[in-house]
Amino acid sequence: KSSSEATNITPKHNMKAFLDELKAENIKKFLHNFTQIPHLAGTEQNFQLAKQIQSQWKEFGLDSVELTHYDVLLSYPNKTHPNYISIINEDGNEIFNTSLFEPPPAGYENVSDIVPPFSAFSPQGMPEGDLVYVNYARTEDFFKLERDMKINCSGKIVIARYGKVFRGNKVKNAQLAGATGVILYSDPDDYFAPGVKSYPDGWNLPGGGVQRGNILNLNGAGDPLTPGYPANEYAYRRGMAEAVGLPSIPVHPIGYYDAQKLLEKMGGSASPDSSWRGSLKVPYNVGPGFTGNFSTQKVKMHIHSTSEVTRIYNVIGTLRGAVEPDRYVILGGHRDSWVFGGIDPQSGAAVVHEIVRSFGMLKKEGWRPRRTILFASWDAEEFGLLGSTEWAEENSRLLQERGVAYINADSSIEGNYTLRVDCTPLMYSLVYNLTKELESPDEGFEGKSLYESWTKKSPSPEFSGMPRISKLGSGNDFEVFFQRLGIASGRARYTKNWETNKFSSYPLYHSVYETYELVEKFYDPMFKYHLTVAQVRGGMVFELANSVVLPFDCRDYAVVLRKYADKIYNISMKHPQEMKTYSVSFDSLFSAVKNFTEIASKFSERLRDFDKSNPILLRMMNDQLMFLERAFIDPLGLPDRPFYRHVIYAPSSHNKYAGESFPGIYDALFDIESKVDPSQAWGEVKRQISIATFTVQAAAETLSEVA
């Protein structure tokens, strides 16, 4: 039976009814409810919230709502033995200690169980030594230090500013450079916007504010002790020495008041250029060690955190599809927070809650979606995307056969300037068409579409007149669905106008000051941006679950494949002599991309013209669309990253948050001029080109006529 037969109202009316039911006032109320106490993963408070959400989703009308639990490795500070950093004099006396906690915001002084700032999964240790300032601790920062400035970080404690890249990459880079410890701090240059006051008077980071966060390098593994398999009752667990992605050196985060005290004494080399200088009143000398009078003083870290296997809980709600119940569209976002989670994650969880309520209202009126919609409240995202990954590992066989799409729903806002979307190219047309139908919430765009304000404020860098849609990277719960399983995925949120700080978050990210009041007073008093995000996320889910033909356009993959092939070829052509010497050719890849383009166009023609009343044909065409993303998965995974299996996209090896195209080829080419064995290095480039070529060609074949 067709989609419209599955309901008592026409499909167009369904979508309007669904969107009209979404209310800003409800999102506001839900956000307030979710942010009154901390909901740290593995705690009783977060278990209670899981049960509350389960109960409310049932009330809203979902067919079933279950809790699924896993026992995963988490990390906590030692309550009786706090973490801190000191400056010690030649006698070993502590002459300065960093603060043990963030001053709580007004009204929250008596809240218990606020976890002090820490770097989750840091090993214990008390290293002491000279300090080296390493800027953002990016790959290029260490290249600058080691290759240009000839500064050796071996045996040193490094201090790095947060921002630009995922903190786990910073720690990995420091480890590889031989550091014995890492201090992470928030520089005002990255976390204090000019002309804005500190919290509670504005949305800027106060000097005592600190960003928490995990420092793992999991590369998609999930629970460090059970990579590839769910962390259930009968799971085999690795020993800690074999655990995936754990850092080997102590790490600790601090605020800029404390950072000032460490950085102001720095001596040694001057910073190489202005890009290494933040906005503290310090010289930003690189070191190693302190200057002149202070040269005998050292820095000492005191880290006593423990890692322990702890139970976590996901909430999984189901709204059964009327026509294709075995096809799943998933809307998921996490529930666990570092402290109150005013933005991350509860601004997203509140939107999911309202989307569930609206779908529930339609169901109570007799409507059902064509396909099954699964709603998820993930646990332990902050500890390495653990809840979503374990659930996907447990259900991988079902997901790879039945998963149509995954829409992520973490923080709804990271600013209030314009829309930000990252998604598979299959969803480009869906996103563009949907945003053309939605009203912009932006001032100065009254009566205009969201598409219009988005295009104006965030234009595509290569396609003028269109808005920017970015590649999916990682650092959020879509990772396992997209990068490991090859399920078409997307995410949307409202963002800031801060192009220069592309991967530096909003100032109060992961601090105690991320409260309900932060959102209600400074970011979205009318909750109109939250409502818009609910409409985008909900609208995408609605279309994906209810349209007769899946709203995927394979021609858009052809466009980006050409662009990515051009890009990687241009990178390779920086080495024309070696390309000649080692007979490196991209001809096969360009040929495969051309074949994909041709077959995708032919498929689109058939899609337009086939008999949509024939259920077998319809299912066949939809399956070709659903399985296209899956066709880009290499079962062997990327080199040394077996859980990143998508050949077209992977998280950057240098920044987990960013997406890289043709990552296998990109990584093989990266810094190739420094490789010891150029013949082997260029051989790997050729191998990666052949894998990419095969994958693109194989994906194209899945779109060919089946017989």
């Epitope: 269109m466 001809d587 360009f590 383009t597 013209d609």
Partner: antibody, heavy 121, light 111 residues
Framework: EVQLVESGGGLVQPGGSLRLSCTAS????????MSWVRQAPGKGLEWVSA????????YYADTVKGRFTISRDNSKNTLYLQMNSLRAEDTAVYYC??????????????WGQGILVTVSS | QSVLTQPPSVSAAPGQKVTISCSGS????????VSWYQQLPGTAPKLLIF???KRPSGIPDRFSGSKSGTSATLGITGLQTGDEADYYC???????????FGTGTKVTVLG
């Protein structure tokens, strides 16, 4: 049989605007990249702009970037070229061309008859 | 200023063979497919060769294409008076993200 018919050309003053249209028939318009190619009097062919199949990603030659806008209406099987801030050197016969492969430009297997645009005061 | 270079003109007697070269770089001809177009006087261009060496239906096998490295060649054998026209090579340029045409070559049939 594929047919491409351009319209909207004519005489315009420097700094003025013009909108060219190209109506297509005989193939599934939405699946193919479409291009505009121009030829100044007595000169060679110059590719101006293309738009992909699918959602319609635009591409432009550096000479027209920021002044010309390509668009398509798949429901009307029509390709457009909005030309603003026209200059004397934009004077040419403008051809509409269909790609022979699919969603991005590879080669042009069908061409319109061309339309003359004259920019002069 | 075209990034693909062709000779301005070539000529030969009827029945003879002519070749037209098209020289580019690694970012265009080097890694992309070359096509050739014929433009008879006063008419729109017509596709002659695509994918370096393939002929659309209706194009006689007197016309052939080849590509080597960063250059492409169009060959016309058994030259006829009806072959008098301008010929253009064209390809995608991966660095410019743009389509590029050659400077064009005028073929004259002598006598």
């Amino acid at each position: 049989e594929v047919q491409l018919v351009e319209s909207g050309g004519g005489l315009v003053q420097p700094g003025g605007s013009l909108r060219l249209s190209c109506t297509a028939s005989g193939f599934i318009f939405s699946s193919y990249a479409m291009s505009w190619v121009r030829q100044a009097p007595g000169k060679g062919l110059e590719w101006v702009s293309a738009i992909s199949g699918g959602y319609g990603a635009p591409y432009y030659a550096d000479t027209v970037k920021g002044r010309f806008t390509i668009s398509r209406d798949n429901s009307k099987n029509t390709l457009y070229l909005q030309m603003n801030s026209l200059r004397a050197e934009d004077t040419a016969v403008y051809y509409c061309a269909k790609d022979g492969v699919g969603a991005t430009p590879y080669y042009f297997d069908d061409w319109g008859q061309g339309i003359l645009v004259t920019v002069s005061s | 200023q075209s990034v693909l270079t062709q000779p301005p003109s070539v000529s030969a007697a009827p029945g003879q063979k002519v070749t037209i070269s098209c020289s580019g770089s690694s970012s265009n001809i080097g890694n992309n497919y070359v096509s050739w177009y014929q433009q008879l006087p006063g008419t729109a261009p017509k596709l002659l060769i695509f994918d370096n060496n393939k002929r659309p239906s209706g194009i006689p096998d007197r016309f052939s294409g080849s590509k080597s490295g960063t250059s492409a060649t169009l060959g016309i054998t058994g030259l006829q008076t009806g072959d008098e026209a301008d010929y253009y090579c064209g390809t995608w340029d991966s660095s410019l993200s743009a389509y590029v045409f050659g400077t064009g070559t005028k073929v004259t049939v002598l006598g």
